[in-house]
């Protein structure tokens, strides 16, 4: 007698973070076989879906048309196989983008730096906001908060050719909803090729500043099962 | 083996409550949905709902939504089904079931609640 | 909701027959369906689930088929512990159904 399923996956389409008016698809990835998939927000039901045929059918999506704050928060789901339940997916975290205003991202001293220099963004909003989010583009997209009342500085330390790579900076206005995005500061490490050669794929920051949040582009979805299981897991908690 | 031990017969006026419980032996409580059915005298079988004991999730039949309450009390492996309002149209054998992968597979031997002024 | 429909209510076999019991969802439940066993002053017992396949320590005179809205609860030849009402239940949506039942009584 089979006592548990394995959770399934949950990752939002094209992406976690979604402007306000835009559509978002979530979707869960359990078994074949499944009877129904239901989607949870926030702790509660949110919506039910029955694939038909079951036997054929291993994922189903969930169609947000009109992103807002109302729906930006939590999701999980779950699935059945006759009576028995699944355990609850990860959780996803769904965010609302482009609300109020836009902050101004610079880099100190430059976007161009050598290896070892010491790097800090400073991400700025003048209206009321106390919560700033620096991001790293790519897939593997890292995720900084800064507090300050008009503006917060994010210190990279001293850089490596890791660095490398396009920022763009966020107001949060509460953990799911972010203001429009910053224009992107393009930063350029140089470094001797020794040192590049040996640099890590992504930099090592401080465990209590940084989490690791996979971009769910659809390439890697398709490749990769593990990136599913971490779409934009524990973001901001 | 698998047990679900059901409380003993309760006899009702109309308006009051009920609270029938289940103790569930020979498995892992929270691994598994419990489900309640009820049966009228000489009548069918009538699903009421189920509760997950691990999240407490519950789902009703829309029929039994507004007095049902389903909980389920994870350290002492025993699922509850309270019934308030009781008229005598509820006067039935109430079955506590096991939901697994096959269906309902084990069930309660039922508890009588009869409803009578 | 989905309601079953389950036919006949009631009849009258001898021990030897093959006995028949058909079941009709209102709409497709893709073989999510359940067949139980009855006898008076008993709870329910699983016979089959997911329209075909027999639970643990039934009898192989048991047999469930069926697709889409039409199923069948089969007795190959009927034993005397078998004279009993038959259920049969859907678990496709909310709420789950049964049928009206069937009786199975001695000719």
């Known amino acids: 007698q089979q006592q548990t399923l394995p959770k399934p996956f949950i990752w939002a389409e094209p992406h976690f973070m979604v402007p306000k008016e835009k559509q978002v698809t979530i979707c869960c990835q359990g078994n074949y076989g499944a009877v129904e998939y239901q989607l949870h927000f926030e702790g509660s039901l949110f919506a039910v879906d029955r694939p038909k045929p079951p036997e054929r059918i291993n994922k189903v999506k969930f169609y947000i048309p009109d992103m807002n704050s109302r729906m930006a928060g939590q999701y999980s789901c779950i699935y059945r196989v006759g009576e028995l339940w699944s355990e609850p997916s990860n959780l996803l975290d769904l965010v609302v983008t482009e609300m109020y205003d836009t902050p101004t991202l610079s880099v100190h001293p430059g976007p161009e730096v050598i290896s070892g220099e010491k790097v800090t963004f400073y991400c700025r909003l003048d209206t009321a906001t106390s919560m700033f989010l620096l991001l790293k583009e790519g897939r593997s997209s890292h995720v900084q908060r800064g507090y300050g009342k008009v503006q917060a500085e994010f210190p990279l330390g001293p850089v490596t050719t890791a660095h490398r790579g396009t920022y763009r900076c966020f107001g949060s206005y509460n953990n799911h909803a972010w203001s429009f995005p910053s224009e992107p500061v393009k930063l350029l490490v140089t470094g001797d090729i020794e040192n590049t050669s040996l640099a890590p794929e992504d930099p090592t920051f401080p465990a209590d500043t940084w989490g690791t949040y996979l971009l769910t582009t659809e390439t890697g979805l398709q490749k990769d099962h593990a990136l599913w299981d971490h779409t934009a897991q524990n973001l901001l908690r | 083996q698998v047990q679900l031990v059901q409380s003993g017969a309760e006899v009702k006026k109309p308006g009051a409550s009920v609270k029938v419980s289940c103790k569930a032996s020979?498995?892992?409580?929270?691994?598994?949905?419990m489900h309640w059915v009820r049966q009228a005298p000489g009548q069918g079988l009538e699903w009421i709902g189920y509760?997950?004991?691990?999240?407490?999730?519950?789902e009703y039949n829309q029929k039994f939504k507004d007095r049902t309450t389903l909980t389920a009390d994870k350290s002492t492996s025993t699922a509850y089904m309270e019934l308030s309002s009781l008229r005598s149209e509820d006067t039935a054998v109430y079955y506590c079931?096991?939901?697994?992968?096959?269906?309902?597979?084990?069930w309660g031997q039922g508890t009588l609640v009869t409803v009578s002024s | 909701d989905i309601q079953m429909t389950q036919s006949p209510s009631s009849l009258s076999a001898s021990v030897g027959d093959r006995v028949t019991i058909t079941c009709r969802a209102s709409?497709?439940?893709?073989?999510?369906l359940a067949w139980f066993q009855q006898k008076p002053g008993k709870a329910p017992k699983l016979l089959v689930y997911?329209?075909?396949n027999l639970a643990d320590g039934v009898p192989s005179r048991f047999s469930g088929s069926g697709s889409g809205t039409d199923y069948t609860l089969t007795i190959s030849s009927l034993q005397p512990e078998d004279f009993a009402t038959y259920y049969c239940?859907?678990?496709?949506?909310?709420?789950?159904?049964f049928g009206g039942g069937t009786k199975v009584e001695i000719k």
């Open positions: 079931v096991r939901g697994s992968s096959r269906g309902f597979d084990y």
């Open positions: 509760i997950n004991p691990s999240s407490g999730y519950t």
């Open positions: 997911a329209a075909t």
């Open positions: 709409e497709n439940i893709y073989s999510n």
């Open positions: 239940q859907h678990f496709w949506g909310t709420p789950r159904t």
């Open positions: 020979g498995y892992t409580f929270t691994s598994f949905t």
